[in-house]
Amino acid sequence: VEVKVPTEPLSTPLGKTAELTCTYSTSVGDSFALEWSFVQPGKPISESHPILYFTNGHLYPTGSKSKRVSLLQNPPTVGVATLKLTDVHPSDTGTYLCQVNNPPDFYTNGLGLINLTVLVPPSNPLCSQSGQTSVGGSTALRCSSSEGAPKPVYNWVRLGTFPTPSPGSMVQDEVSGQLILTNLSLTSSGTYRCVATNQMGSASCELTLSVTEPSQGRVA
């Protein structure tokens, strides 16, 4: 059986229904069987877990997703084996295997792979700071969201009115969420906001930086 699945990965927002398209061409016999299985990201296909079977005219959802899986067409014997997965969770991200068996049609292995990403907005990030906050020193402001798919990009902005920092004194990494401030001056003091953004939305946190004279301590 030759199975056809989309070549591009599928993305579905958190809580919505994912339709994993799988079609095939074969003269369906009584021995026809369909199996959908799931493998977590980074794991080999051999570690897949079944989530739905169709055999002998009956449908058998199985495993932790069993209450949320169904077929677009039941029975799936018309050439359409598309899986519907409702109320998608972050843990549904991974590779789904559609396998059609129909002896004696052994033309190919009857297997199709679909990568699903569940899109999750960034969670409220955590802002933190480390380093020397005295004049002339350097500090790193860090920002990280524990949730978000695809991985959020981070952007730091300083709130309020302030003199333009000298070039190179503020360097940020949008991927790691780190903002490096060098050659600190008293005017570097203020509130800094980090905004974590992906295609599902954004979330932010704020941090107040107090730059002190070298003899004094630091306040965060």
Epitope: E2, T23, S25, V28, D30, G57, G79, D105, Y107
Partner: antibody
Amino acid sequence: EVQMVESGGDLVKPGGSLKLSCAASGFTFSNSGMSWVRQTPDKRLEWVASISDGGLYTHYPDSVKGRFTISRDNGKSTLYLQMSSLRSEDTAIYYCARQGVRPFFDYWGQGTTLTVSS
Amino acid sequence: DIQMTQSPASLSASVGETVTMTCRASENLYSYLAWYQQKQGKSPQLLVFNAETLPEGVPSRFSGTGSGTHFSLRINSLQPEDFGSYYCQHHYVIPWTFGGGTKLEIK
């Protein structure tokens, strides 16, 4: 030699019923998916029903769903098509066809004619 | 349902000529397409399946090409027995549908 012989075609009034038969030989009937395909007077071909090797799965296009029933008797190597609520647009030559491993039709019978007319 | 459109509806040619007829699908069929030949008063006969595979016994002057939505059947060096009607059929998802046919006549 693969052979399929259809029978049962007739002149039927609209709303009437009829059962077609197809006697197959020359191949292992019980291992083969089978279909009925019709050819209308304007020469168009239309697939009307299919059945899996053991009869577990049957399929129909919307045009005949609920009116036609395909069945088989593997012991007799015979395919059937029970037709009811017949309409004038069902007038056609009905062919019995064997399906290949893929759903194309590799052997056809000689056909039997159904005419639906008052 | 997948619609199948054949062109031309009819075609005149002489023995020895080469002819090509086409079949267009309303959706992607990959290579799931068959061609049939039907002579006057006879039942259809399979000529090509999977777009380009010839069953045993079909002369090599017949050839099928195409994938996706566009398909062609070519007959090289026409023989007297090649005249008749030709139909395409998709063998993808149910319902399986046929084109309206191309009638090949002797010029």
